[in-house]
Interface confidence: low
């Protein structure tokens, strides 16, 4: 059986808020659920929608959401279906209108001394409550010959008089909110002293230095007094003026005219009529001065031809508003056509390469003109000047790959080298013709390089092969100087690269051959069995013959490598004892010997007092420290080679002797005992 | 530590010819891409580009001074010379020697310059 | 020759505030755009190369912008140390040439 965990109740909504009527189901299969209003489905919308199986108000609505909504869960497979109990909204609004002339029934019948009824057409639920307004002005019930009836929002004059005339406006709240009118009465009782208007004063929008003039009249009988104030309730006539209004004029017929209207001037102007009878009428005019900002910067367009593009031009700030309009080479542009103006925008369909240039977008007002260009460039596919072509380079040397093309704008161009782009560094550098420069050209720059020239209409590319001619070198070059070991087999390599093989040979420095038991094997110079006399000075030649020939000089040493003779063995030490490290080595040229300790090489120079390296190279340490415990290492290098040994040196605390162990037992250590 | 240092006369007469050295180190004029240019500034004023050489003796020379200057360079000494004729007292500045590397970053090292006055 | 015209000639600007100067050269450059720092009786220093590259040790609040014609070299948050003239150099061709410099003042 289907089961309703959660029904819908019924609620109060606000108008124009969220709201949610929740359902929730369970069933032994799977269900589907929808909703109906009145009987009828309900379609998601976006104010409206199911929301899992509930269902969700993004805004209530008054009118589309009253009724009584149900929330049905079917079983598809079964055909059970359960319905949950009828929920509806009590929903709560306010809505403005206009104050209308209920009685009589037109304002030509409006006459002194009859009985007038105002409505004001404000709704809501619940049914708000009212408040009138005349002039601006609050009425209260039973004051001055009016009665409010707030039941039926209406406004009643009896009688109406000359003291009744004005602006009649209304405005409502209740527990969703408050309205005003949106269109208030005007009741006008003529009573022949009370003043009239005429003629009422216009805001006004003058350039600086410019005249403004506001006109005002009211009648009367018998006629009103007129008078012109100035924002701060400063009076301005003929006669007294305020310093910063000494070119205002007052005419006859109560105009005002301001002449060379600076900023000071700007404001509000009150023209205030007075009849013999009645309230005085205050009429407001505001002077604006016409102003008009910069405008902003373009940034130049790139468009391709055959597209649809606009440019649109944001108007300056200004009072009044600025009118816009484009030009192209000094023509204002039509409001139709292939390239026109609509509204604020410049449009150019169906692109065409003519269309190219600088318009021009001019806004103006009172204030004055201002412009902006905007540079619009029709962008064109790329054209050769120049491809690269295959090239033979040389090695070491700068070489160049041109790429020369022309498009509008300024074409874009990126080199590839084996499909990969090149980026600039200190080996490759883009020319701003398109031209790539190697700047010292190796031999694995052998390949395919690709240049491609673009531009936002599109693209051109070219490859071309590079073959690297190389340079006859060494490769590597030999070490300068070299050691070989007395009574043993030594070779020395010797390579060298080229545009052609070249051909390698060696010879001793001083012109004499190579003794029978030294060989030259394709550049490798084998010696069988070093004897003293093979050291000197010897050229490896490699030649080929379109590069000529190079040389390189190599020293050769003859040298007994390094043998220890002594080393360092693993020491213990008491504390504050002696510790002995030997260390002898022998070899020709003779080695020195050095000492490493705790990762850092011991400087006989600054040993210190309880250090001293020995002439045959031992170390001896006075009052050792546990902070002397670790590895020592004795290096023994000359000339030709280096070698190295080592062993730890441990320091330790003197074990105090217990009464059972006999006066000579050793102690637990093998140790140095000084 | 790439550095330069201009060495000249402090005070040179109207019509005679100053000769500034530019000692650097740190770099070699034999290496690609390398160049040395020289850079003057009259006092309270902007700069002014002069002259300049590059590692494989191209040389390029401000055309409003061309016919008054000449660049040389000394690899082996790691020197580049300027020498300017005909000198006047607008020609008043501290002149500057700097490196540049091509397709890298121009002008990046500065010499700490020298004064020349030309007073009579 | 390329001319740079170099805007503006002096700027006063707060501890913090992004400042920024512009430098439009009177034909293409490319993204050949040098900007110098020069402090009262110092060598000018590079601070950006190629437009928009920082040299090495240059802090990270200095940066270029620009291409073609017109460029920016901006401050992000202007500090203490940062008052001196500011130059920008074009080295797209020769003759090379300098923009008319920019004082930069603390307010």
């Known amino acids: 059986a289907i089961v309703f965990i959660k029904q819908p109740s019924s609620q109060d909504a606000l108008q124009g808020r969220r709201a949610l009527l929740r359902c929730e189901v369970e069933a032994p299969g799977p269900v589907h659920v929808y909703w109906l209003l009145d009987g009828a489905p309900v379609q998601d919308t976006e104010r409206r929608f199911a929301q899992g199986s509930s269902l969700s108000f993004a805004a209530v609505d008054r009118l589309q959401d009253s009724g009584t909504f149900q929330c049905v869960a079917r079983d598809d497979v079964t055909g059970e279906e359960a319905r949950s109990a009828n929920a509806s909204f009590n929903i709560k609004w306010i809505e403005a209108g206009p104050v209308v002339l209920k009685h009589p029934a037109s304002e030509a019948e409006i006459q002194p001394q009859t009985q007038v009824t105002l409505r004001c057409h404000i709704d809501g639920h619940p049914r708000p409550t009212y408040q009138w307004f005349r002039d601006g002005t609050p009425l209260s019930d039973g004051q001055s010959n009016h009665t409010v009836s707030s039941k039926e929002r209406n406004l009643t004059l009896r009688p109406a008089g000359p003291e009744h005339s004005g602006l009649y406006s209304c405005c409502a709240h209740s527990a969703f909110g408050q309205a005003c009118s949106s269109q208030n009465f005007t009741l006008s009782i003529a009573d022949e002293s009370f003043a009239r208007v005429v003629l009422a004063p216009q805001d006004v929008v003058v350039a600086r230095y410019e005249e403004a003039m506001f006109h005002c009249q009211f009648s009367a009988q018998p006629p009103p007094s007129l008078q012109w104030l100035f924002e701060d309730e400063t009076p301005i006539t003929n006669r007294s003026r305020p310093p910063h209004l000494r070119r205002a004029t007052v005419f006859a017929n109560g105009s005002l005219l301001l002449t060379q209207v600076r900023p000071r001037n700007a404001g509000i102007y009150r023209c205030i009529g007075q009849g013999q009878r009645g309230p005085p009428i205050i009429l407001e005019a505001t002077l604006h001065l016409a102003e008009i900002e910069d405008m902003p910067l373009f940034e130049p367009r790139v468009f391709t031809a055959g597209s649809e593009e606009r440019v649109t031009c944001l108007p300056p700030k200004g009072l009044p508003e600025p009118s816009v309009w484009w030009e192209h080479a000094g023509v204002r542009l039509p409001t139709h056509g292939r390239v026109y103006q609509k509204g604020h925008e410049l449009v150019l369909a169906n692109i065409a390469e003519s269309d190219a240039g600088v318009y021009t977008c001019h806004a103006a007002n009172l204030a004055g003109q201002r412009r902006q260009d905007v540079n619009i460039t029709v962008a064109t596919v790329p054209s050769w000047l120049k491809k690269p072509q295959d090239s033979q380079l040389e090695e070491g040397k700068p070489g160049y790959l041109d790429c020369l093309t022309q498009a509008t704008p300024k074409p874009t161009v990126v080199w590839y080298r084996n499909q990969m782009l090149i980026s600039e560094d200190s080996r490759f550098e883009v020319f701003k013709n398109g031209t790539l420069r190697i700047n010292s050209v190796e031999v694995y720059d052998g390949t395919w390089y690709r240049c491609m020239s673009s531009t936002p209409a599109g693209s051109i590319e070219a490859q071309a092969r590079v073959q690297v001619l190389e340079k006859l070198k060494f490769t590597p070059p030999p070490q300068p100087q070299q050691c070989m070991e007395f009574d043993k087999e030594a070779t020395v390599p010797c390579s060298a690269t080229g545009r052609e093989k070249p051909t390698i040979k060696w010879e001793r420095a001083d012109g004499s051959s190579l003794p029978e038991w030294v060989t030259d094997n394709a550049g490798t110079l084998h010696f069988a069995r070093v004897t003293r006399d093979d050291a000197g000075n010897y050229t490896c030649i490699a030649s080929n013959g379109p590069q000529g020939q190079i040389r390189a000089h190599v020293q050769l040493t003859v040298a007994v490598f390094i043998t220890f003779k002594v080393e360092p063995e693993r020491t213990t030490v008491y504390q504050g004892h002696t510790a002995l490290l030997q260390c002898e080595a022998q070899g020709d040229p003779k080695p020195l010997i050095q000492w490493k300790g705790k990762d850092r090489i011991l400087d006989p120079t600054k040993l210190g007092p309880r250090m001293h390296i020995f002439q045959n190279g031992s170390l001896v340490i006075h009052d050792v420290a546990p902070e002397d415990s670790g590895r020592y290492t004795c290096i023994a290098g000359n000339s030709c080679n280096i070698k190295h040994t080592e062993a730890p040196l441990y320091v330790v605390d003197k074990p105090v002797p217990e009464e059972s162990e006999g006066p000579g037992s050793p102690p637990p250590y093998k140790m140095i005992q000084t | 530590q790439i550095t330069l240092k201009e060495s000249g006369p402090t005070l040179v007469k109207p019509t005679q010819t100053l000769t500034l050295t530019c000692t650097f180190s740190?770099?070699?004029?034999?290496?690609?891409?390398?160049?040395v240019g020289w850079i003057r500034q009259p006092p309270g004023k902007a700069l002014e580009w002069l002259a300049h050489i590059w590692w494989d003796d191209d040389k390029y020379y401000s055309p409003s001074l061309k016919s008054r200057l000449t660049i040389t360079k000394d690899t082996s000494k790691n020197q580049v010379v300027l020498t300017m004729t005909n000198m006047d007292p607008v020609d008043t500045a501290t002149y500057y020697c700097v490196r540049s590397n091509y397709g890298y970053a121009w002008f990046a090292y500065w010499g700490q310059g020298t004064l020349v006055t030309v007073s009579s | 020759d390329i001319q740079m015209t170099q805007s503006p000639s002096s700027l006063s600007a707060s501890v913090g505030d992004r400042v920024t100067i512009t430098c439009k050269a009177s034909?293409?450059?490319?993204?050949?755009l040098n900007w110098f720092q020069q402090k009262p009786g110092k060598a000018p220093k590079t601070l950006i190369y190629?437009?928009?590259r920082l040299l090495d040790g240059v802090p990270s609040r200095f940066s270029g912008s620009g291409s073609g014609t017109d460029f920016t070299f901006t401050i992000s948050s202007l500090q203490p140390e940062d008052i001196a003239t500011y130059y920008c150099?074009?080295?797209?061709?020769?003759?090379?040439?300098f923009g008319a410099g920019t004082k930069l003042e603390i307010k």
């Open positions: 740190g770099f070699s004029l034999s290496t690609s891409n390398m160049g």
């Open positions: 150099l074009q080295y797209d061709e020769f003759p090379l040439t």
């Open positions: 190629r437009t928009n």
């Open positions: 034909q293409d450059i490319y993204p050949y």
